[in-house]
């Protein structure tokens, strides 16, 4: 009988140890959850405050409606210009409308005067069609005014208030474009 009692006592003790372990695990888990929650809340607060404090466009970029534009201060060939824009998560300018063209040319007049600026327009070597980099065709009013006589690849650029074409390997300034951040109010 004594042996039976001690066996029960041992089983109870074992159960108690298991429950203590479970409680300890639960406490640890709860603490871990609380820490994670704190981290998540801090992360969200930081994100929200930085989003609230940040302007829709980065420094030295110009905003118009939903877009941000960067007018370069260096010259490069068309392909390098494209890569320079990608480095900032943007692309060479794609002009969608006459209103956007007017804004760009107006801004350029204020900033720099009459220089050449690469945009994201190039001519397909086979068909001769003009294409923006996303594969769309420019609207009829936004086709380059002159056809370049170059045997090499031909790309589009803006000068004054015109869209023109030139050998992609010539050096020009360039304009990058990306979406403006939405203000979180």
């Amino acid at each position: 009988k004594l042996l039976q009692v001690s066996t029960i006592a041992m089983q109870q003790q074992e159960k108690l140890i298991q429950q203590e372990r479970a409680l300890l695990n639960f406490t640890e888990w709860k603490r871990s959850c609380a820490l994670q929650m704190k981290y998540c809340q801090a992360f969200m607060q930081n994100s929200l405050s930085s989003a609230h404090n940040s302007s829709p466009c980065p420094n030295n970029w110009i905003q118009n409606r939903e877009s941000c534009y960067y007018v370069s201060e260096i010259w490069s060939i068309w392909h390098t210009s494209q890569e320079n824009c990608l480095k900032e998560g943007s692309t060479l300018l794609q002009i969608e409308s006459k209103e956007e063209m007017d804004f760009i040319t107006g801004s350029l007049r204020k900033i720099k005067g009459s220089y050449d600026y690469w945009v994201g327009l190039s001519q397909d070597g086979h068909s001769g069609r003009w294409l923006w980099q996303d594969g769309s065709s420019p609207s009829p009013g936004l086709l380059p005014a002159e056809r370049s006589q170059s045997a090499n690849q031909v790309c589009g650029y803006v000068k004054s208030n015109s869209l023109l074409s030139s050998n992609c390997s010539t050096w020009k300034y360039f304009i990058c474009e990306k979406y403006a951040l939405r203000s979180s109010v």
């Epitope: 890569e83 990608l86 480095k87 900032e88 998560g89 943007s90 692309t91 979406y179």
Partner: nanobody, 117 residues
């Protein structure tokens, strides 16, 4: 540090399709855009498609309408779906992660694509 690893290359007949994948590991928040480049023997490396962190896609005129670039932010991968492949598409394909101005960009090791009958 960011590591990029391409996969999915191989041999395919003209008119066939391949899907390349570029997996990014490390501090990928520093990447503003990913581009797929290709280099055929004796030719310069050319950018064929790119996608920015805002999801803006660009293509070179030589692949427009045939190649599609896409990204999966959960898996941290950028894919290049290549359809209607031509022998002139044969090259080593590399993915490149564009960091900000004045920062060093990241390159993968490359994957070979061969289009021939």
């Amino acid at each position: 540090q960011v590591q990029l690893q391409e996969s999915g290359g191989g041999w395919v007949q003209p008119g066939g399709s391949l899907r390349l994948s570029c997996a990014a590991t490390g501090s990928i928040v520093s990447i503003n855009a990913i581009g797929w480049y290709r280099q055929a023997p004796g030719k310069q490396r050319e950018l064929v498609a790119s996608i920015t962190n805002q999801g803006i896609r660009n293509y070179s005129t030589s692949v427009m309408g045939r190649f599609t670039i896409s990204r999966d932010d959960v898996k941290n991968t950028v894919s290049l779906q290549m359809n209607s492949l031509k022998p002139e598409d044969s090259a080593v394909y590399y993915c490149k992660g564009f960091a900000g101005w004045g920062k060093e960009d990241y390159w993968g090791q490359g994957t070979q694509v061969t289009v021939s009958s």
